[in-house]
């Protein structure tokens, strides 16, 4: 079951998953000037059995300018640099978390992927919060959020974290001091990891009382 909403927003904080539950989708997106290969996958999917989980499908990008020429999928060593993953940079994966049964690790980068990764989380997913550079964490409780199903609806628990404007960075649970903290991003960019299904739309078909997610019309 996909989580309907985004994880909660905490002012001056970003979040990331240490590992991804089976059923998680990752959009296959390419950077500007590149596109998915013909007949390519639209997304990767974390799948597995009781003993092993892995990402199904491979995202592949090819130059928009050329036809039928596929760029290599496995990045060269010099390309394996820090990348944005969901709202975070540089996935710092504690082995114990990434090796959880029924979970996938952060997928390796593919060549010419978009600068931002979009994940679609499933029920039971946990994300961890960290204050952005220049802010210090005041913990009232766990700095994490879990997607839970209650009464047939999904919801994210509220992380107990306040980020205050002091020049000191916080760390993820169990981490040593990071060499560099993730930079904060403009608020307009911190949207939409998953979306709500509670779209209430009145269609122009007044004869029915149905609601639907989209209204279509031609111009």
């Amino acid at each position: 079951e996909l989580c309907d909403d985004d994880p909660p927003e905490i002012p001056h904080a970003t979040f990331k998953a240490m590992a991804y539950k089976e059923g998680t989708m990752l959009n296959c997106e390419c950077k500007r000037g590149f596109r998915r290969i013909k007949s390519g996958s639209l997304y990767m999917l974390c799948t597995g059995n009781s003993s092993h989980s892995s990402w199904d499908n491979q995202c592949q990008c090819t130059s928009s300018a050329t036809r039928n020429t596929t760029k290599q999928v496995t990045p060269q060593p010099e390309e394996q640099k820090e990348r944005k993953t969901t709202e975070m940079q540089s996935p710092m994966q504690p082995v114990d978390q990434a090796s959880l049964p029924g979970h996938c690790r952060e997928p390796p980068p593919w060549e010419n992927e978009a600068t931002e990764r979009i994940y679609h989380f499933v029920v039971g997913q946990m994300v961890y919060y960290q204050c952005v550079q220049g802010y210090r964490a005041l913990h009232r409780g766990p700095a994490e959020s879990v997607c839970k199903m209650t009464h047939g609806k999904t919801r994210w628990t509220q992380p107990q974290l306040i980020c205050t404007g002091e020049m000191e960075t916080s760390q993820f649970p169990g981490e040593e001091k990071p060499q560099a903290s993730p930079e904060g991003r403009p608020e307009s960019e911190t949207s939409c990891l998953v979306t709500t299904t509670d779209f209430q739309i009145q269609t122009e078909m007044a004869a029915t009382m149905e609601t639907s997610i989209f209204t279509t019309e031609y111009q």
Partner: antibody
């Protein structure tokens, strides 16, 4: 025939998401045909080869609206055009009511 | 492109009947298959995703199975509201493709 049509698809009551918006058409008495889709947060569109060069799918995040423009219309483009929220592996779970386009 | 072939193209059945519709893919699509129901003048409705997972709100008399190239959707006891056209759809690769549809009619 020969003209263009632009169909709009507005989402409201929630965030205009990172899921794809797919466009599917259905000619009278025929089956469903996927034309293409777009992920609004990225703005990149993906088209079925059959429509490549004739269809343009765009999205305006500020108004939570996706658009499908089909050019060089011919009589066989007469169909109902649907938009749908496409959750990939999890299916197209919510659909618009459809827009009938008649080319005559 | 992956071709989805549905059979039968139409069938007649009575209320209470067990109905099975088959969908075959031209290549393996693992379990990347969805089923939709469409009634006249209405938009399609998602019934089953990932070959066998029931969409929220869909009655439990609907079930799906299969993996690779062969898939089925079964209605265990046909109800009056189930008379409609049923489509399969693969999400394994682009372009996304649908089966030709199966029209379930009243006998």
């Amino acid at each position: 025939p020969g003209s263009s049509v632009k169909v709009s698809c507005k989402a409201s009551g929630g965030t205009f998401s990172s899921y794809a918006i797919s466009w599917v058409r259905q000619a009278p008495g025929q089956g469903l045909e996927w034309m293409g889709g777009i992920i609004p947060i990225f703005g990149t569109a993906n088209y079925a080869q059959k429509f490549q060069g004739r269809v343009t799918i765009t999205a305006d995040k500020s108004t939570s609206t996706a658009y499908m423009e089909l050019s060089s219309l011919r009589s066989e483009d007469t169909a109902v055009y649907y938009c749908a929220r496409d959750k990939g592996y999890y299916g197209m779970d919510v659909w618009g009511q459809g827009t009938t386009v008649t080319v005559s | 492109d992956i071709v989805m072939t549905q059979s039968p193209s139409s069938l007649s059945a009575s209320i209470g009947d067990r109905v099975t519709i088959t969908c075959r893919a031209s290549q393996s699509i693992k379990n990347y298959l969805n089923w939709y129901q469409q009634k006249p003048g209405k938009a399609p409705k998602l019934l089953i995703y990932a070959a066998s997972s029931l969409q929220n709100g869909v009655p439990s008399r609907f079930s799906g199975s299969g993996s690779g190239t062969d898939f089925t959707v079964t209605i265990s006891s046909l109800q009056p509201e189930d008379f409609a056209i049923y489509y399969c759809q693969q999400t394994y690769s682009t372009p996304l493709t649908f089966g030709g549809g199966t029209n379930v009619e009243i006998k």
